[in-house]
C-alpha cells in the first residue's frame, strides 16, 4: 500500500515512515499490515485468499501378480517401466473412475514379489470450508475401491483375464497426507500483534480475515459518524466534531449540540 507525497514536506515525511515503512523517494512503501501517508494506519482486512484447490496424497502398495518382475522395472527410464506405468495408470483410472476428486497415480517404486507397486493416489478438490470432509470421504472410497478390485481381479490357474491381476493380501495404505489450510491460523499470523482482534468470517464460502473496523460483517464495529481505528488495545472509534455537534462515547453515538454548551452566540471557537 502506497501514498504519494509532493512538495517540500516530503523530506520530513521520509524520516517519519512508521511501522517498518520505507521511503522510495516519493512515498512511504508500507508493509502489508499498514497504510496511510506515514503507514500509520492498520488495515481492516487482510487477504488470506484460500488456494483454489486442496490436495491429498495417499501412499498405497499393491501387488500385481499378472506381471513377472524383471530387472528393467527398477529403472524408471526403461521402456519396460514406462509401459508398466502406462498400463497401471490406465487400470487405476478405471478403478477410481467414479471418484470426482481423483487426479491420478504416481508410481514411486517397483520391487520384486510378483511386482510390488509403491505408489501415490492423488486427490484434489475445490476449496470449500468442508474440504477436509470431502477429502476424507474420497480417501475412504479409494480404500474401498482398491480393496474391491484387488479381491476380484485375481489369477485363476496362473492366468489373468483382466488388464491386471492382484494379490488380495498385498494391498496396504501406508499414509494419507492432506494439504493443510487453516484460515484462522493464517489470519492470526498475518495480523501479527493485532492477531487477537482479527477474525475469519465467511462470505460465499470464501474466508475473509477482518478486524471489527471492516464494515459489512457480523463483527463490524459501528462507529456511526466516527472512524474505526485499530490500536494494540483493539478497535476504537475516533469520534468527529462537526460544525454543530461534538460526538463521544464508545461508538460515537452520543452527540452534543455545540450551541447548548456555548450558548447561541458562540458558534465556534
Amino acid at each position: 500500500r502506497t501514498t504519494t507525497c509532493f512538495g517540500d514536506g516530503c523530506q520530513n515525511t521520509a524520516s517519519r515512515c512508521k511501522n517498518g515503512g520505507t521511503w522510495d523517494g516519493l512515498k512511504c512503501q508500507c508493509p502489508n499490515l499498514y497504510y496511510g501517508e506515514l503507514c500509520e494506519e492498520v488495515v481492516s482486512s487482510i487477504d488470506i485468499g484460500p488456494p483454489e484447490t486442496i490436495s491429498a496424497q495417499m501412499e498405497l502398495t499393491v501387488t500385481v501378480t499378472s506381471v513377472k518382475f524383471t530387472e528393467e522395472l527398477k529403472n524408471h527410464s526403461s521402456q519396460e517401466f514406462q509401459e508398466f506405468k502406462q498400463t497401471f495408470t490406465e487400470q487405476m483410472n478405471i478403478v477410481y473412475s467414479g471418484i470426482p476428486e481423483y487426479v491420478g497415480v504416481n508410481i514411486t517404486k517397483l520391487r520384486l514379489g510378483s511386482v510390488v507397486v509403491e505408489h501415490d493416489v492423488l486427490l484434489r478438490t475445490k476449496y470449500t470450508p468442508e474440504y477436509k470432509t470431502v477429502l476424507d470421504n474420497a480417501t475412504e472410497v479409494v480404500k474401498e475401491k482398491i480393496t474391491k478390485v484387488t479381491t476380484q481381479q485375481i489369477m485363476i490357474n496362473d492366468i489373468c483375464s483382466d488388464m491386471m491381476c492382484f494379490n488380495t493380501t498385498g494391498t496396504q495404505v501406508q499414509n494419507i497426507t492432506v494439504t493443510q489450510y487453516d484460515p484462522e491460523e493464517d489470519c492470526r499470523k498475518m495480523a501479527k500483534e493485532y492477531g487477537d482482534y482479527f477474525v475469519v468470517e465467511y462470505r460465499d464460502q470464501k474466508p475473509y480475515c477482518i478486524s471489527p473496523c471492516e464494515p459489512g460483517f457480523s463483527v463490524s464495529k459501528n462507529c456511526n459518524l466516527g472512524k474505526c481505528q485499530m490500536s494494540l488495545s483493539g478497535p476504537q472509534c475516533l469520534c468527529v466534531t462537526t460544525e454543530t455537534h461534538w460526538y463521544s462515547g464508545e461508538t460515537c453515538n452520543q452527540g452534543t449540540q455545540k450551541s447548548l454548551v456555548y450558548g447561541h452566540h458562540h458558534h465556534h471557537h
Partner: nanobody, 123 residues
C-alpha cells in the same frame, strides 16, 4: 517405433491347417510377451495363444491341442500353427506384444498391435 505385421491368413476348409506369421520390428523379441488375439464379426477380441520371453506358453481352452504358438527371436518373428480348423475359428487374427512378462489374456494389457490377417474356415 514398434511395428507388427501379420501374414498367412486365408480361406481354408474345415479340418485344414494354416500357419500365421508376425514380423516384429523395433521390438526386442527376446523380451516380454507376444500373443495372438482374434476377433469374429460382432464379437469381442479374445486371446488365443501367448508366449513369454522364457518360452512359457498358454492357450485359450477352445484351441488347446489344435494351435501351437512359437517365436523365433533371431528373426524377430511370432508364429501360430493352426490345425484341425473349425468354422468357429473364422476371425481376424491379430499379433500383439508387450515389453513386460505378462500372464494376462486381456487385450488391454498389450500396447503393440498389428493390423490383422483374415482367417476364414468354410467349405
Amino acid at each position: 517405433d514398434v511395428q507388427l505385421v501379420e501374414s498367412g491368413g486365408g480361406l481354408v476348409q474345415p479340418g485344414g491347417s494354416l500357419r500365421l506369421s508376425c514380423a516384429a520390428s523395433g521390438f526386442p523379441s527376446s523380451r516380454g510377451t507376444m500373443a495372438w488375439f482374434r476377433q469374429a464379426p460382432g464379437k469381442e477380441r479374445e486371446g488365443v495363444a501367448f508366449i513369454n520371453s522364457d518360452g512359457r506358453t498358454s492357450y485359450a481352452e477352445s484351441v488347446k491341442g489344435r494351435f501351437t504358438i512359437s517365436r523365433d527371436n533371431a528373426l524377430s518373428s511370432l508364429y501360430l500353427q493352426m490345425n484341425s480348423l473349425r468354422a468357429e475359428d473364422t476371425a481376424m487374427y491379430y499379433c500383439a506384444a508387450s515389453l513386460l512378462y505378462l500372464m494376462t489374456v486381456n487385450a488391454a494389457a498389450y500396447p503393440y498391435w498389428g493390423q490383422g490377417t483374415q482367417v476364414t474356415v468354410s467349405s
